[in-house]
């Protein structure tokens, strides 16, 4: 059950404060666990994580992962769980801490010979051994050798958006994920109405930039939903 | 700055109903999900139920079947119906308003509070 997940809610120390809001005006939700104690300005995180409703893991902190807090439990209910450590079971990498990541279900560190050549092989897998080109794009990628060691640059192989640069996120690029840039005003972004509709994206767009949400284009009000567009707007 | 003021608290008799109103508001105001939380005299804080935008719902064992949280989007609301109140009910109930921290580096996705409303049970 959740509260055997949460059994304590201590409250403990204190982070920088949230640099901004998600979402757009009037959207009623997101989830995680640090907090503003009421009557003050400073965050405070809180011991075994108050519960954070979310449907993926880019929802969630860069020490979160996304997923039902019980084992076989209720399946629409997914919370930011703590990530795990090395050594500790996974089944992707996105559950495993930063500097780790998920090999034959256990979390190993992201030690950069083993990880680019677990990368290597996880992508010749999903595409085949045939080494040509899709769209120009070669089907074999390799991490920087600096990987770990600086911030990956504009698409460099990632796991996790703290992988990447400042201005960066990690999203989907064919079956493998890179470091895309974060978007700005005016750009399109993609709004997903469904639960884990970002599994259809091949080419995920990374989301809006501090100060800005995804919402309808105000000239495209009136168009079908199937086809309105979205863009980067300020609150 | 987000502000969160939460109404609709106050003394009720065992087995009574309430309902909790939480009107967010602010220049810069957005969440992903909307809660609740509730601090008994002597406890610590504990999770009551949450809404995401989407509208999956999430309850703590102790209020499933009793309370419903709900949103209205476009007034920035959310609400907890609370029925078949009990004593152990009892306590400052407040709202909050969270974002993920991902996309802003942070380690854990966070919630803003309100100052709280007191809900009493008693006879």
């Known amino acids: 059950t959740l509260n055997s997940v949460l059994n304590s809610n201590a409250i403990k120390n204190l982070p920088p404060p949230l640099g901004g809001a998600a979402g757009h005006p009037g959207s009623a939700v997101s989830a995680a666990p640090g907090i503003l104690y009421p009557g003050g300005n400073k965050y405070q995180t809180i011991d075994n994580y108050q519960p954070y409703p979310c449907a993926e893991d880019e929802e969630c902190g860069t020490d979160e992962y996304c997923a039902s807090p019980t084992r076989g439990g209720d399946a629409g209910v997914q919370i930011c769980l703590a990530c795990r450590k090395r050594r500790k079971r996974c089944m992707r990498h996105a559950m495993c801490c930063p500097g780790n990541y998920c090999k034959n279900g256990i979390c190993v560190s992201s030690d950069q010979n083993h990880f680019r050549g677990e990368i290597e092989e996880t992508i010749t897998e999903s595409f085949g051994n045939d080494h040509s080109t899709l769209d120009g794009y070669s089907r074999r990628t390799t991490l920087s050798s600096k990987m770990y060691h600086t911030k990956g640059q504009e698409g460099s192989v990632c796991l996790r958006s703290s992988d990447c640069a400042s201005g960066l996120c990690c999203a989907r690029h064919f079956w493998s994920k890179i470091c895309k840039p974060v978007l700005k005003e005016g750009q399109v972004c993609t709004k997903h109405r469904r639960k884990g509709s970002h599994g259809l994206e091949i080419f995920q767009r990374c989301y809006c930039g501090e100060g800005l949400s995804c919402r309808i284009q105000k000239d495209h009000h009136q168009a079908s939903n199937s086809s309105r567009l979205h863009t980067c707007q300020r609150h | 700055e987000v502000q969160l003021v939460e109404s609709g608290g106050g003394l009720v008799q065992p087995g009574g109903s309430l309902r909790l109103s939480c009107a967010a508001s602010?220049?810069?105001?957005?969440?992903?999900?909307m809660g609740w939380f509730r601090q008994a005299p002597g406890k610590e804080r504990e999770f009551v139920a949450a809404?995401?935008?989407?509208?999956?719902?999430l309850y703590a064992d102790s209020v499933k079947g009793r309370f419903t949280i709900s949103a209205d989007n476009s007034k920035n609301t959310a609400y907890l119906q609370m029925n078949s109140l009990k004593p152990e009910d009892t306590a400052v109930y407040y709202c909050a308003a969270g974002n993920g921290g991902r996309q802003y580096g942070h380690s854990r996705a966070r919630y803003d509070w309100g100052q709280g409303t007191l809900v009493t049970v008693s006879s």
């Open positions: 602010g220049r810069r105001f957005s969440a992903d999900v």
């Open positions: 809404i995401r935008s989407g509208g999956t719902t």
